[in-house]
């Protein structure tokens, strides 16, 4: 069992969904779990989040906000073998840019 490389970071806008892949070469029913190292608190043990969503072990986090920031790590286990762990993907949550003042309808501009 071995893991493919995962992206070092993922940038997602506030309120959007984050999709994390956990690519591995297991042909069997591998058990994928996801863990998070909290942003700004790297001395804590990783936090257990739960299983992946599909046979590929994708993690989907809906409606992300700033508190979702951190490093997301997947672990893959086949049977009772020791798990393999990804290097982790750092989730950056981006504030959407403010709407420009001039970005308004023609009707509003002409008032």
């Amino acid at each position: 069992l071995w893991m493919h490389k995962v992206p070092a970071s993922l940038m997602v806008s506030l309120g959007e969904d984050a999709h994390f892949q956990c690519p591995h070469n297991s042909s069997n029913n591998a058990n994928v779990t996801w863990w998070r190292v909290l942003h700004g608190n790297y001395t804590w043990p990783p936090e257990f989040l739960g299983p992946g969503e599909d046979p590929n072990g994708t993690l989907i986090i809906q409606n992300v906000n700033k508190s979702h920031g951190g490093i997301y790590v997947c672990r893959v286990q086949e049977g009772n073998e020791s798990y393999q762990q990804s290097c982790g993907t750092y989730l950056r949550v981006r504030q959407p840019p403010p709407r420009p003042f001039l970005d308004m309808g023609e009707g509003t501009k002409n008032r």
């Epitope: 998070r36 989040l49 739960g50 299983p51 599909d54 989907i60 986090i61």
Partner: antibody, heavy 116, light 111 residues
Framework: EVQLLESGGGLVQPGGSLRLSCAAS????????MNWVRQAPGKGLEWVSG????????YYADSVKGRFTISRDNSKNTLYLQMNSLRAEDTAVYYC?????????WGQGTLVTVSS | QSALTQPASVSGSPGQSITISCTGT?????????VSWYQQHPGKAPKLMIY???KRPSGVSNRFSGSKSGNTASLTISGLQAEDEADYYC??????????FGGGTKLTVLT
């Protein structure tokens, strides 16, 4: 502070239905797989059902498979358990819980009584 | 999904040490070491005492310790105190988002 608040319990007749809710606050709810765990009067803890963070994966104990449905509304930070075809042996306190690791959170539970 | 096996009851005098065992199969425990121990007083929700087999959450007394060897996990309470009298449950991750609990052990502190 993390809070999980269950509601919806009560007295129901055998064969009846009930829907439990669990309102979560103080945690990044959408990140976590969530679970329902129950405890019959004077008995031990029994895992009932689990759901992945986005709701794409659902899991059930054999004792409730086909009768109970777990779901979640991530826009409301709420977990649900729809319980149909209830039996006397489903009588228990039902806890909503995030299990595993140091971020392990439980509600105070809601009592479901199935009796005629 | 059979329950993990725990002794129904254990007892000890104040100041003594007791150990509660929790036995399962290799598929119950896997290699993730996601084994937790809970303390439950009557009418209360379970309280996490040990996570990942041997780690103590902040706020839990260092009189509580956990270990795991093969398919058996153990909880040891040293320097027994009256307030330790409660029910204790082990719990293990069993893949997907499924969990298995032990049948529970009633701890009596003899006075």
């Amino acid at each position: 502070e993390v809070q999980l608040l269950e509601s919806g319990g009560g007295l129901v007749q055998p064969g009846g239905s009930l829907r439990l809710s669990c309102a979560a606050s103080g945690l990044t709810f959408t990140s976590y797989a969530m679970n329902w765990v129950r405890q019959a009067p004077g008995k031990g803890l029994e895992w009932v059902s689990g759901i992945s963070g986005s709701g794409g994966g659902t899991y059930y104990a054999d004792s409730v498979k086909g009768r109970f449905t777990i779901s979640r509304d991530n826009s409301k930070n709420t977990l649900y358990l729809q319980m149909n075809s209830l039996r006397a042996e489903d009588t228990a306190v039902y806890y909503c819980a995030k299990l595993g690791g140091w971020s392990d959170y439980w509600g105070q539970g809601t009592l479901v009584t199935v009796s005629s | 999904q059979s329950a993990l096996t725990q002794p129904a009851s254990v007892s000890g005098s104040p100041g003594q040490s007791i150990t509660i065992s929790c036995t399962g199969t290799s598929s119950d425990f896997g290699s993730y070491n996601l084994v937790s121990w809970y303390q439950q007083h009557p009418g209360k929700a379970p309280k996490l005492m040990i996570y990942e087999g041997s780690k103590r959450p902040s706020g839990v007394s260092n009189r509580f310790s956990g270990s795991k060897s093969g398919n058996t996990a153990s909880l040891t309470i040293s320097g027994l105190q009256a307030e330790d009298e409660a029910d204790y449950y082990c719990c293990s991750y069993a893949g997907g988002s499924t969990w298995v609990f032990g049948g529970g052990t009633k701890l009596t502190v003899l006075t």
